[in-house]
Interface confidence: medium
């Protein structure tokens, strides 16, 4: 969880950012109530991007991917790293900067028609059921606006969960990622003891659905650590 990332004081009491005075209404529409933010740039942050711990690419920014900072480093220590530009080495799509994808270990432009064709084959079109959800991440490829609104059904190849239809998430299956169902109450889930440990899974499960959390099954409390069964349970 984020609790292990942010110390208890990091976001408890918000100081007026960059010299703005608390209690003075900002001029921008939808600005934070009571905060004036000089320059009006809603997306800037105060610090100089100290490394942000992560467990998966989707926890990083659009121009980042999640990996160990050192080659062959401890899989349990991962941070958000700057994406790889065109012609740089890669191991998966998310490592490449927006507008590129990973092909044969090299980041190449995704403008090429053959790549769009591959995506069109693997993502089921559902324009009548366009769920723009909280789950959303803009796709890292430069697809047409028509393509942007397609949502993959169960089993469709995906890059991230926003590629999948409502009720599905993008999870690893062997060495690719496909849309799988979000877990329901009572279903077995994976509780990761260490940050980044699910990088080792080749059959990754989705997370538990709304109002559920992944906890040890009641009758398994006495079992050994290695055999504890986790299921999605009501909070």
């Amino acid at each position: 969880t984020l609790n292990s990332v942010l110390n208890s004081n990091a976001i408890k009491n918000l100081p007026p950012p960059l010299g703005g005075a608390a209690g003075h209404p900002g001029s921008a529409v939808s600005a934070a109530p009571g905060i004036l933010y000089p320059g009006g740039n809603k997306y800037q942050t105060i610090d100089n991007y100290q490394p942000y711990p992560c467990a998966e690419d989707e926890e990083c920014g659009t121009d980042e991917y999640c990996a160990s900072p050192t080659r062959g480093g401890d899989a349990g220590v991962q941070i958000c790293l700057a994406c790889r530009k065109r012609r740089k080495r890669c191991m998966r799509h998310a490592m490449c900067c927006p507008g590129n994808y990973c092909k044969n270990g090299i980041c190449v432009s995704s403008d090429q028609n053959h790549f769009r064709g591959e995506i069109e084959e693997t993502i089921t079109e559902s324009f009548g059921n366009d769920h723009s959800t909280l789950d959303g991440y803009s796709r890292r490829t430069t697809l047409s606006s028509k393509m942007y609104h397609t949502k993959g059904q169960e089993g469709s190849v995906c890059l991230r969960s926003s590629d999948c239809a409502s009720g599905l998430c993008c999870a690893r299956h062997f060495w690719s990622k496909i849309c799988k169902p979000v877990l329901k109450e009572g279903q077995v889930c994976t509780k990761h003891r260490r940050k980044g440990s699910h990088g080792l899974e080749i059959f990754q499960r989705c997370y538990c659905g709304e109002g559920l959390s992944c906890r040890i099954q009641k009758d398994h409390h006495q079992a050994s650590n290695s055999s504890r069964l986790h299921t999605c349970q009501r909070h």
Partner: nanobody, 127 residues
Framework: EVQLVESGGGLVQPGGSLRLSCAAS????????MGWFRQAPGKEREFVAV???????NYADSVKGRFTISADNSKNTAYLQMNSLKPEDTAVYYC?????????????????????WGQGTLVTVSS
């Protein structure tokens, strides 16, 4: 732009519970984090809880163990379940949505200006 509408506020006795809801509309596909903040009369606004798209959560120390943040992606809705409420929890509660940035930093979640905001819902804890 994301539009956020909170509901569920009201008057509750100490020790009671409330569930706040936040319905998001507009460019919700760009949301990276959904958060709840609160502002008590005469005080600065403070962070309450945040949930990332992937489900990671963080809470202010003052609400840990009492409040639970969650999100239903299919309904574009975030929730704040508040249990064991105390008089000091009395405040206007704001729902907030932050877009996915190009680069993530620890301070991204603490910078109020990164969020779009709802109008707020009043929670009063009093006997």
């Amino acid at each position: 732009e994301v539009q956020l509408v909170e509901s569920g506020g009201g008057l509750v006795q100490p020790g009671g519970s409330l569930r706040l809801s936040c319905a998001a509309s507009g460019r919700t596909f760009s949301n990276f984090a959904m958060g709840w903040f609160r502002q008590a009369p005469g005080k600065e606004r403070e962070f309450v809880a945040v949930i990332l798209r992937g489900g990671s959560t963080n809470y202010a120390d003052s609400v840990k163990g009492r409040f639970t943040i969650s999100a239903d992606n299919s309904k574009n809705t975030a929730y704040l379940q508040m249990n064991s409420l105390k008089p000091e929890d009395t405040a206007v509660y704001y729902c907030a949505a932050a877009p996915r940035p190009k680069r993530v930093s620890v301070s991204y979640f603490s910078t109020a200006s990164n969020y779009d905001w709802g109008q707020g819902t009043l929670v009063t804890v009093s006997s």
